[in-house]
């Protein structure tokens, strides 16, 4: 009976025309959904003048419906048993599941200045910036809709900038209209045991963005794992998101909608500083705002981010050390609702449910040249938005499951 | 490759004049902005004169403004640096750089320098 299941499973499980899993990797069957909360600055003209606290308040959920566009360029190589695609971007609000519009105004860190500030470094320029910055009217902070801030706006200053600069920014430009990837996986025909695992990504077995083996990317994109899952295992994971690959482990045994499930979940040795966690040391690439790499809870992203200064958390510095949120007040961390955590349907390593859960923040210093910056005293690692991803395996598909899966090992 | 390469330094009396050129070579002169800096032992590089691409903004440090004059010109991939009333000072390491601005990146380049001496 059991080698029968197994026999089938590793048959259904391959990404190849035909399988159970193929249809629902296309094309995910699961509504996913994006939410986001935007950390309101309360105090902004403080902050600016007297390099106070920042006081922060969250405003949301903002929802968007997200991954609902099949994979493209879905291209088999019967050669080395993989598939390669891409992964098209879309996001649709969902109004009815959001506290307001997208044109609801947030006072947010000015995105442009303090990008600008931290990569922009020489002295003429930073001259050159500074009268942009006043002339243009642009300060330490600024008002936006959750729509600019999110997709995209031309920022005054930038456009006056006399060279070929960039001059749209958003937390998430450009988004519409664009595509993660190329993945090429492992398709299991071989091998069931690689099934889903990327072999590269961008053409490339390593990131570029980190040292050692920090660089590399590890296991599937946390959609399936390879079957026949182990409470014992760590699974690995790569996501594009925070440019890394990272692993969650077995933390409860859980029912949903019937179906047994191991949800694992990201630890807080993950986000561990190399002190305590001495595997973490290639993620720490600088020394003065990691204070000699002791701080911990914050990845810097720059490299992967055009050399932004985009630092990445979990929501309201979950895990996070004390000097990084100590100069931010309003944030209340707690697990339940701040960490990430993945459903796993044992059997066929299927993610019937997941929430995933990060924080975007952008790290703004004292600058001699630049006015709205002359009075800080500190660096501000300064939370802009958190978001969690979720998505649920749907009412029929879980009858199903349960009917051809868990009902027939039972 | 980008070179940038000064010349002109030399040793002068109070009051005289000098005249710095630095040529570059390898990118697009026209499209960075040109600078000379200056260093003296133990201290920073401080931004003495600056221009932008052609028909930009230029700026002078306030010690050495209505005496010295920076210039150039792309058709000979040239910067320069003209200083009158010289004053013991001006005694540096004369440094000249290019930058310019491209998506969300900075190319900043710099020539070896040339000594200016101003001693009576």
């Known amino acids: 009976g059991d080698l029968l299941i197994q026999k089938t499973i590793k048959k259904q499980v391959v990404l190849e025309e035909g399988t159970i899993a193929f249809k629902n990797w296309v094309k995910t069957g699961t509504e996913v959904y994006r939410q986001f909360w935007i950390f309101d600055v309360q105090n902004p003209q403080e902050v600016m003048m007297n390099s106070s606290n920042i006081q922060v308040k969250q405003r949301g959920p903002y929802t968007y419906r997200v991954r609902f566009l099949a994979k493209e360029n879905v291209t088999q190589d019967a050669e080395d048993n993989t598939v390669s695609f891409l992964q098209p971007n879309g996001a649709i609000f969902e109004p009815s599941l959001s506290v307001g519009t997208e044109a609801d105004n947030f006072t947010v860190l000015n995105l442009a200045v303090a990008a600008a500030s931290h990569i922009y470094q020489n002295q003429f320029v930073q001259m050159i910036l500074n009268s942009l910055i006043n002339k243009s009217k642009s300060s330490m902070f600024q008002v936006r809709t959750l729509r600019e801030l999110l997709w995209g706006y031309r920022d005054p200053f930038l456009s006056l900038v006399p060279y070929p600069v960039t001059t749209t920014v958003g937390l998430f430009y450009p988004y519409n209209n664009t595509a993660d990837g190329v993945y090429k996986v492992f398709n299991g025909k071989d091998n069931i045991s690689k099934v889903a695992i990327i072999d590269t990504y961008k053409g490339k077995r390593n990131l570029s963005y980190w040292e050692s083996h920090c660089d590399m990317i590890n296991g599937t994109d946390a959609a399936s794992f390879p079957p026949f899952v182990e409470k014992s295992q760590v699974l690995q994971f790569f996501s594009s998101d925070i440019c890394r690959s990272i692993y969650a482990v077995f933390e409860s045994d859980v029912n949903l909608k019937g179906i047994p499930v191991y949800r694992f979940v990201l630890p807080s040795k993950a986000f561990a500083s190399p002190v305590e966690n001495p595997d973490n040391y290639c993620f720490c690439t600088e020394k003065i705002i990691s204070k000699n790499c002791t701080s911990y809870g914050v990845l810097d992203i720059s490299k992967c981010k055009e050399g932004r200064p985009v630092y990445i958390s979990l929501p309201h510095f979950l895990y996070a050390s004390p000097d990084v949120s100590e100069p931010i007040d309003g944030l209340n961390p707690n697990e339940e609702e701040h960490r990430t955590y993945l459903d796993i349907e044992p059997i066929t390593g299927f993610t019937l449910q997941f929430a995933k859960r990060l924080q975007v923040n952008l790290l703004v210093k004292p600058s001699e040249k630049i006015q709205v910056l002359k009075n800080l005293k500190r660096n501000y690692i300064v939370p802009i938005l958190w978001l969690n991803e979720t998505g649920t395996i749907g009412d029929e598909k879980a009858n199903m499951f349960r009917s051809q899966v868990t009902g027939k090992i039972n | 490759q980008v070179q940038l390469q000064e010349s002109g330094g030399g040793l002068v009396q109070p009051g005289e004049s000098l005249r710095l050129s630095c040529a570059a070579s390898?990118?697009?002169?026209?499209?960075?902005?040109m600078s000379w800096y200056r260093q003296t032992p133990g201290k920073e590089r401080e931004l003495v004169a600056a221009?932008?691409?052609?028909?930009?903004?230029?700026y002078y440090a306030d010690s050495v403004k209505g005496r010295f004059t920076i210039s150039r010109d792309d058709a000979k991939n040239t910067v320069y640096l003209q200083m009158n009333s010289l004053k013991p000072e001006d005694t540096a390491v004369y440094y000249c750089?290019?930058?310019?601005?491209?998506?969300?990146?900075?190319?900043?380049?710099w020539g070896q320098g040339t000594q200016v001496t101003v001693s009576s």
């Open positions: 750089n290019a930058v310019t601005l491209q998506g969300w990146s900075e190319y900043d380049y």
């Open positions: 221009m932008q691409s052609t028909g930009g903004t230029t």
């Open positions: 390898g990118f697009t002169f026209s499209n960075y902005a």
